[in-house]
């Protein structure tokens, strides 16, 4: 039975040319996290494997930095970065937990962070 929950940074916005940290946190489970995948729509951005460490997709290597923690930092943001991002926690023995973040990249200098929310 999967008892865990993923808390994410929720709906967030950032300025074009800036950077943003995508964060997820898995709680309420004793399952072992074997790997975390970060995906944008259907594209794999990066993985953090418990044994092998961080590996960033070559397509995003110039603009994606690992961390902090199991989070992911996106740099040199463009309007095209607007969209859904997913943190996918592969765990044992629970299975897979997925968190969703919506990022809006704004042209203006008014970019305020949304509130946190929980995905059961």
């Amino acid at each position: 039975m999967m008892t865990g929950t993923i808390e994410t940074t929720g709906n967030i916005s950032a300025e074009k040319g800036g950077s943003i940290i995508l964060q997820c946190h898995l709680s309420s489970t004793t399952a072992q996290v074997t790997q975390v995948n970060w995906e944008q729509q259907d594209q794999l951005l990066a993985i953090c494997n418990a044994d092998l460490g961080w590996h960033i997709s070559p397509s995003f290597k110039d603009r994606v930095a690992p961390g902090p923690g199991l989070g992911l930092t996106l740099q040199s943001l463009t309007v095209n970065d607007t969209g859904e991002y997913f943190c996918i926690y592969h765990t044992y023995p629970d299975g897979t937990y997925t968190g969703r973040i919506f990022l809006e990249v704004l042209e203006s200098s008014v970019a305020e962070h949304g509130a946190r929310f929980q995905i059961p």
Partner: nanobody, 118 residues
């Protein structure tokens, strides 16, 4: 069926070099991250080095940085571990691992013995 076959181990004097190979079959190479681990007698298996996405990512354990180099030949589906300036504490059975990028599932080779004499 995923298969990993290590080779290249042996006995070498301290300060010497060895090159380990891991020949992989049964999967699409680019879909996996490949790693080397080692286990010394009476100790837990420990991470040594990893490589992924055709060599665009490499990670190393602090204890081997600057001495060991991991590389991959995608055409041959083979991963290498070049080990220089070997020390007696590098003595261990070295294992190759393949980790599926999509979900973290791992596969292991049988290991190859490396012995560094002083």
């Amino acid at each position: 069926e995923v298969q990993l076959v290590e080779s290249g181990g042996g006995l070498v004097q301290a300060g010497g070099s060895l090159r380990l190979s891991c020949a992989a079959s049964g999967f699409i190479f680019d879909s996996y991250a490949m790693g080397w681990f080692r286990q010394a007698p009476g100790k837990e298996r420990e991470f040594v080095a990893a490589i992924s996405w055709g060599g665009s990512n490499t990670n190393y354990a602090d204890s081997v940085k600057g001495r060991f180099t991991i590389s991959a030949d995608n055409a041959k589906n083979t991963v290498y571990l070049q080990m220089n300036s070997l020390k007696p504490e590098d003595t261990a059975v070295y294992y190759c691992a393949a980790v599926r990028i999509t979900d973290g599932r791992d596969y292991w080779g049988q290991g190859t013995q490396v012995t560094v004499s002083s």
